[in-house]
């Protein structure tokens, strides 16, 4: 009785269960009652990452430097090449097909998380007591200067974009 379903890592063809090709290999010829499935390794620039019956291997991804991409991990016969972005850039999508410059945090905002090759800068508003007066992809919000520790007094209050201005204490007259 010919099978209607096959075991894991097998496929049904012409009422027969044939072994799938292992990752890194493509199908050349289906099995017969007498012969095992014929598989061939993918060439150097190709890969297949699953047990398969593909007759063609997939081309490795090309990390195009014109799009700001560079190789993070070279592909093998079983894995695709992983691209990342050059310094100062990050991927526009999970598949990392192109790159854009990291965004800078505007004055009044500081860097919560520095950008990587795959994620953009994360900014946060400077809370009370902190400020940022620059547009930067690296700078965190800085604390206002503590006038008291310098034996000074606050002459001008700080904001989320400016530091406090300290000045000397007024001397009491005798």
């Amino acid at each position: 009785e010919p099978p209607t379903a096959c075991r894991e890592k097998q496929y049904l063809i012409n009422s027969q269960c044939c072994s799938l090709c292992q990752p890194g290999q493509k199908l050349v010829s289906d099995c017969t009652e007498f012969t095992e499935t014929e598989c061939l390794p993918c060439s150097e620039s190709e890969f297949l990452d699953t047990w398969n019956r593909e007759t063609r291997c997939h081309q490795h991804k090309y990390c195009d430097p014109n799009l700001g991409l560079q190789v993070q991990q070279k592909g093998t016969s079983e894995t695709d090449t992983i691209c990342t972005c050059e310094e100062g850039l990050h991927c526009t999508s999970e598949s990392c097909e192109s790159c854009v410059p990291h965004r800078s945090c505007l004055p009044g905002f500081g860097v919560k998380q520095i950008a990587t090759g795959v994620s953009d800068t994360i900014c946060e508003p400077c809370p009370v007591g902190f400020f940022s007066n620059v547009s930067s992809a690296f700078e965190k919000c800085r604390p206002w200067t503590s006038c008291e520790t310098k034996d000074l007094v606050v002459q001008q209050a700080g904001t989320n974009k400016t530091d406090v201005v300290c000045g000397p204490q007024d001397r009491q007259r005798a």
Epitope: N14, S29, D30, C31, T32, E33, F34, T35, E36, E38
Partner: antibody, heavy 117, light 109 residues
Framework: QVQLVESGGGVVQPGRSLRLSCAAS????????MHWVRQAPGKGLEWVAV????????YYADSVKGRFTISRDNSKNTLYLQMNSLRAEDTAVYYC??????????WGQGTMVTVSS | EIVLTQSPGTLSLSPGERATLSCRAS???????LAWYQQKPGQAPRLLIY???SRATGIPDRFSGSGSGTDFTLTISRLEPEDFAVYYC??????????FGGGTKVEIK
């Protein structure tokens, strides 16, 4: 390169025996089924026998059933055809050929068997 | 047993002409398992076409196969001097036996 080379042919008297060999090289012999096909002088191709890659499945043409035995030794990359009770009509060139789902893709050069008194 | 009948027995043509060879089966054959072979004098057969219409590795594109069910055709679009030979069809769908047709000889006119 992928190659099949037959040997063991010759002239033999009717009723006698002969063993043909087919030496394989250039491919994983133990993964392929193998066939014997023959061709009488001036005639067409006639399929004789097949054996599966591990030797468990064997089929024969009615004309040789009970007289011929196909076997293989995967450790020696060699296919055999034991021919007993030979008849004049067994006179032919005997070819071994590799089995695939695409047909017989590799053939040997053949070995001549002549059954004559 | 599936009987394959090839016609014509002999085809006399000149180089450059088109050759059409027929193979008829006594019952329906899965086209996945119909092959054509070429054999020259003193040589072993060579696989030309498998699965009724797919060319084997290294076979020039002047050779083509077609057909389904019980009627199959091998066409050589423009005969080259090296194409004059005997051609056999074979079915390997229904076995035993694996059957060959009687052959068609393509000879120079």
């Amino acid at each position: 390169q992928v190659q099949l080379v037959e040997s063991g042919g010759g002239v033999v008297q009717p009723g006698r025996s002969l063993r043909l060999s087919c030496a394989a090289s250039g491919f994983t012999f133990s993964s392929y089924g193998m066939h014997w096909v023959r061709q009488a002088p001036g005639k067409g191709l006639e399929w004789v026998a097949v054996i599966s890659y591990e030797g468990s499945n064997k089929y024969y043409a009615d004309s040789v059933k009970g007289r011929f035995t196909i076997s293989r030794d995967n450790s020696k990359n060699t296919l055999y055809l034991q021919m007993n009770s030979l008849r004049a009509e067994d006179t032919a060139v005997y070819y071994c050929a590799r089995d695939t789902s695409r047909g017989h893709d590799i053939w040997g050069q053949g070995t001549m068997v002549t059954v004559s008194s | 047993e599936i009987v394959l009948t090839q016609s014509p027995g002999t085809l006399s043509l000149s180089p450059g002409e088109r050759a059409t060879l027929s193979c008829r089966a006594s019952q329906s054959v899965s086209s996945s398992y119909l092959a054509w072979y070429q054999q020259k004098p003193g040589q072993a057969p060579r696989l030309l076409i498998y699965g009724a219409s797919s060319r084997a590795t290294g076979i020039p594109d002047r050779f083509s196969g077609s057909g389904s069910g019980t009627d199959f055709t091998l066409t050589i679009s423009r005969l080259e001097p090296e194409d004059f030979a005997v051609y056999y069809c074979q079915q390997y769908a229904d076995y035993p036996p694996f059957t060959f047709g009687g052959g068609t000889k393509v000879e120079i006119k």
